[in-house]
Interface confidence: medium
């Protein structure tokens, strides 16, 4: 009379589901950091370099303290998703002179792309309140010359770099309180 | 190119007072939480404080507490620490160094400031 | 007395493998990342290695870390005169609410 049940439902141990995301993390923190120093060396910054358009900084040293799990998740999920999409665009609009990063940003994208998809599981799997679905942006004006995409690139990979370090401190931290 | 250049150092009186400065250029300072970190002569590191990226969160090492204060201008790219109460014990070289999450990237020459009547 | 221990010398020839350990606790190495500095005589301490394995643009990967439980090491093959200098581990501390340091290896090549 149907078929036999499955095998029971085992709830995944959440401090396990943290740890391959802070593993994820970190390695996409190691490839950001390897493709912005390859566009220094390419593209020397001459001082620093910001973009409207991405997010601000969401953690510092005076933060931690407070650091609640679903905020932390909820608000990087949403500066990863940011990131990717200005990532996207840097890959489309930012010109020939960024094309030499090939396929090294496809891939940071792709990886980019697979931690998203690990932190949606892991707030599903922590049964923590999904997200709205994200209003759509609006479109991302291409940069005004060779030079603007190549500022805009050392804008997004630092930006990146700093978002992840964060990430994968206050994830470790929020480990040791599960 | 990332630079973090300290001054203020020198020699002061016991008990008394002296504020160090630390220039950065070649990013954006808003972004990061900065460190102030000494050595004592032939001696190892030691943690002096952080201040968060916007100087609205401070912690401090006990050895400072109440003696010491970090802040910073964000619209000057400087960070300060001014330093009280001065002891013998506090005679050091004063690093100022970057925090992008939990290590310092990147650390300035360093100041020495020598406490001695 | 440092919070972190590591330990005072350590030394090898040109071409040895050395490791410099850095043992601690829960409420710092267990919990948190661990990073080692390097320090050059007469200059500013340099990140060698951050969130306990990763190396910073620049570092050569003869330099590599590990951590387990409350204990983390740093390895260096492949060793250079260029090497001889002082190592310090470090890591957040969540009782004192603040960085440590071990408190320093001088490394001798011989």
């Known amino acids: 009379p149907g078929p036999p049940p499955g095998p029971p439902r085992v709830s995944p141990d959440p401090r396990a589901e943290l740890d391959s995301t802070v593993l994820l993390t970190r390695s996409l923190l190691a490839d950001t950091r390897q493709l912005a120093a390859q566009l220094r060396d390419k593209f020397p910054a001459d001082g620093d370099h910001n973009l409207d358009s991405l997010p601000t900084l969401a953690m510092s040293a005076g933060a931690l303290g407070a650091l609640q799990l679903p905020g932390v998740l909820t608000r990087l999920r949403a500066d990863l998703l940011s990131y990717l999409r200005h990532v996207q665009w840097l890959r489309r609009a930012g010109g020939s002179s960024l094309k030499t990063l090939e396929p090294e940003l496809g891939t940071l994208q792709a990886r980019l792309d697979r931690l998203l998809r690990r932190l949606q599981l892991l707030m599903s799997r922590l049964a923590l309140p999904q997200p709205p679905p994200d209003p759509p942006a609006p479109p991302l004006a291409p940069p005004s010359s060779a030079w603007g995409g190549i500022r805009a690139a050392h804008a997004i990979l630092g930006g990146l770099h700093l978002t992840l370090d964060w990430a994968v401190r206050g994830l470790l931290l929020l480990k040791t309180r599960l | 190119e990332v630079q973090l250049l300290e001054s203020g150092g020198g020699l002061v009186q016991p008990g008394g007072s002296l504020r160090l400065s630390c220039a950065a250029s070649?990013?954006?300072?808003?972004?990061?939480?900065m460190n102030w970190v000494r050595q004592a002569p032939g001696k190892g590191l030691e943690w002096v404080g952080v201040?968060?990226?916007?100087?609205?969160?401070?912690f401090y090492a006990d050895f400072v507490k109440g003696r010491f204060t970090i802040s910073r201008d964000n619209s000057k790219n400087t960070l300060y620490l001014q330093m009280n109460s001065l002891r013998a014990e506090d005679t050091a070289v004063y690093y100022c160094?970057?925090?992008?999450?939990?290590?310092?990237?990147?650390w300035g020459q360093g100041t020495l400031v020598t406490v001695s009547s | 007395q440092s919070v972190l221990t590591q330990p005072p010398s350590a030394s090898g020839t040109p071409g040895q493998r050395v490791t410099i350990s850095c043992s601690g606790s829960?409420?710092?190495?267990?919990?948190?990342?661990v990073n080692w500095y390097q320090q050059l005589p007469g200059t500013a301490p340099k990140l060698l290695i951050y969130?306990?394995?990763l190396l910073p643009s620049g570092v050569p990967d003869r330099f590599s870390g590990s951590k387990s439980g409350t204990s983390a090491s740093l390895a260096i093959s492949g060793l250079r005169s260029e090497d001889e200098a002082d190592y310090y581990c470090?890591?957040?501390?969540?009782?004192?609410?603040?960085?440590?340091f071990g408190g320093g290896t001088k490394l001798t090549v011989l």
């Open positions: 160094a970057r925090t992008p999450g939990s290590h310092f990237d990147y």
């Open positions: 070649g990013f954006t300072f808003s972004h990061y939480d």
């Open positions: 201040i968060s990226y916007d100087g609205s969160n401070k």
């Open positions: 829960s409420s710092n190495i267990g919990n948190n990342a």
């Open positions: 969130y306990d394995d």
């Open positions: 470090s890591a957040w501390d969540d009782s004192l609410n603040g960085v440590v």
